[in-house]
Interface confidence: low
Amino acid sequence: LQDPCSNCPAGTFCDNNRNQICSPCPPNSFSSAGGQRTCDICRQCKGVFRTRKECSSTSNAECDCTPGFHCLGAGCSMCEQDCKQGQELTKKGCKDCCFGTFNDQKRGICRPWTNCSLDGKSVLVNGTKERDVVCGP
């Protein structure tokens, strides 16, 4: 016997209180697949999050981060503070890269300069906090 709920399309839910009639998802909720018995609450992009895509009856809202922050985690579950090039984010905020390390992005951590001598090369251009060394012949 076919489950009557399987006929309910995305954007609706199978309402047990109304003889398993397919009812539209209430405001601020959605169902992205058919045959669902409940609609999921829409994600709200608050605070440091901003709305990239509004919630519809068939798809959840999508968030990104306000300027000065970048997304972290699946589906932008967190916003992480941007730092300047030449810095890394620590639990005390942005800190300059230590000597011998660099970061050429606004996110991520400082990485050691390339050791040119490992490849039998010499340093052509010295490294900075923002840039790796350039190795030469």
Epitope: L72, G73, A74, S77, M78, T90, K91, K92, G108, I109
Partner: antibody
């Protein structure tokens, strides 16, 4: 060789005070953040407080905020933890650790035991 | 506060076996900020892994770390007698700094 040596622990009554010290050697003390981490008998590790290289920025766990004060004297290569209004739940081994911020705590002292009991 | 939950609480294994320890965060943590420590009775903790997967100085290559987001793993490929200890994960992504409750690796 990096060494951290804590001292100042002991038995103190509830409501009392104690000042822990951590003498550092083998590295440029004034260049590093430092932290205190404690461990109650038979329990896990709990971060207590940290301080930046200049001593201007400090942070505390909620459980000790307003009662404990972290400080440092870079001329003496020494880290301190002033503990006031001590409670039974502050009983623990207190470790000082060099704090690499993003990269965790790479060197630890041997710990000093603080017992708060009447 | 980011809560780190370690599992299992105790792992009973024999020398030579593989140990897999889990650390789950209550919210996403950049892998750069996740560390693992080993602690033996009466001793201070020792840093094993930082940045979720980088071995600290002097740590043998049988120790490896992996993971991202909310799920992190410490693997000991072949347990040596000196590896039986308690292991803690720790995050320094945001205040307060937090540790997991620990996993004890004991001899079976």
């Amino acid at each position: 060789e990096v060494q951290l040596l804590e001292s100042g622990g002991g038995l103190v009554q509830p409501g009392g005070s104690l000042r822990l010290s951590c003498a550092a050697s083998g590295f440029t003390f004034s260049s590093y953040d430092m932290s205190w981490v404690r461990q109650a008998p038979g329990k896990g590790l709990e971060w207590v407080s940290d301080i930046d290289p200049t001593g201007s920025k400090t942070d505390y766990a909620d459980s000790v905020k307003g009662r404990f004060t972290i400080s440092r004297d870079n001329s003496k290569n020494t880290l301190y933890l002033q503990m006031n209004s001590l409670r039974a739940e502050d009983t623990a081994v207190y470790y000082c650790a060099r704090d690499l911020m993003v990269y965790g705590f790479d060197y630890w002292g041997q710990g000093t035991l603080v017992t708060v009991s009447s | 506060e980011i809560v780190l939950t370690q599992s299992p609480g105790t792992l009973s294994l024999s020398p030579g076996e593989r140990a897999t320890l889990s650390c789950r965060a209550s919210q996403s943590v950049s892998s750069s900020y996740l560390a693992w420590y080993q602690q033996k009775p009466g001793q201070a903790p020792r840093l094993l892994i930082y940045g979720a997967s980088s071995r600290a100085t002097g740590i043998p290559d049988r120790f490896s770390g992996s993971g991202s987001g909310t799920d992190f793993t410490l693997t000991i490929s072949r347990l040596e007698p000196e590896d039986f200890a308690v292991y803690y994960c720790q995050q320094s992504y945001s205040y307060p700094v937090t540790f997991g409750q620990g996993t004890k690796v004991e001899i079976k």
